[in-house]
């Protein structure tokens, strides 16, 4: 997917943490058994 | 050591396309974004947009949006940032750089300059 | 979009010297600022992020503090090799903006 960024926005982060996206993770999952 | 390591230098037409690649090593390729940023001449840095290597999601700068194409390939720990229609003022030094959630642009490549020129 | 000033844009300074460069943000961005050293012809280097936090390798001469909307770099006593330019980058949202740069000079 694609997002795009630079358009006017007066909103700011009121949270703790970075808005950007975090590290890249491969989400696996194990069959059981 | 983590190293970026990017390809030669271009000179391109106006109305072209350049496609610059970004070889990493020394760390988990798919474990951090890929952010692109370009140096004008005597310019600042601007921020271009970055990939993430595992899903292959990107976020651009609106500026950049319908020009350019960023690509990957896990298997050669390769990123790929294309600029179509290239114009005079696209020549600049062009930086992959790698991004840390928590550190932000950590390590960066070499710097490959873009020539645009008729 | 967030938008960064750097100031001063130009800085003459001798070798020994403190000297202190601010990054003032359009909005709050947290402690979400990073500090870059870019000398000529060479890729810019990480030296501090989210605020304060000093990159690994980077020497205890620089210091970075500040959040919210104003933040300062601090090089505690110029060495020969600090002559460059320096720009402030916000990591709190997107776009990922920089300052136009503060270039130090040798006075």
């Known amino acids: 997917s694609e997002t795009t960024t630079g358009t006017s926005s007066n909103s700011s982060q009121s949270t703790s943490n970075s808005g950007l996206a975090p590290n890249p993770t491969n989400a696996t999952t194990k069959a059981a058994g | 050591q983590v190293q970026l390591v990017q390809s030669g230098a271009e000179v391109k037409k106006p109305g072209a396309s350049v496609k610059v690649s970004c070889k990493a090593s020394?760390?988990?390729?798919?474990?951090?974004?890929m952010g692109w940023v370009r140096q004008a001449p005597g310019q600042g840095l601007e921020w271009m947009g970055e990939?993430?290597?595992?899903?292959?999601?990107?976020t651009f700068n609106q500026k950049f949006k319908s020009r350019v194409t960023m690509t990957r390939d896990t298997s050669i720990s390769t990123a790929y940032m294309e600029l179509s229609r290239l114009r005079s003022d696209d020549t600049a030094v062009y930086y992959c750089?790698?991004?840390?959630?928590?550190?932000?642009?950590?390590?960066w490549g070499q710097g490959t300059t873009v020539t645009v020129s008729s | 979009d967030i938008q960064l000033t750097q100031s001063p844009s130009f800085l003459s300074a001798s070798v020994g010297d403190r000297v202190t460069i601010t990054c003032r943000a359009s909005?709050?961005?947290?402690?979400?600022l990073a500090w870059y050293q870019q000398k000529p012809g060479k890729a810019p280097k990480l030296l501090i992020y989210?605020?304060?936090t000093l990159h690994s390798g980077i020497p205890s001469r620089f210091r970075g503090s500040g959040s919210g909307t104003e933040f300062t770099l601090t090089i505690s006593s110029l060495q020969p090799e600090d002559f460059a330019t320096y720009y402030c980058?916000?990591?709190?949202?997107?776009?990922?903006?920089f300052g136009q740069g503060t270039k130090l000079e040798i006075k």
């Open positions: 980058q916000q990591h709190n949202e997107y776009p990922i903006i």
């Open positions: 750089a790698r991004r840390d959630y928590g550190t932000s642009l950590d390590y």
């Open positions: 020394g760390y988990d390729f798919t474990g951090y974004h």
């Open positions: 909005a709050s961005i947290s402690k979400y």
């Open positions: 990939i993430n290597p595992i899903t292959s999601d990107k």
């Open positions: 989210a605020g304060s």
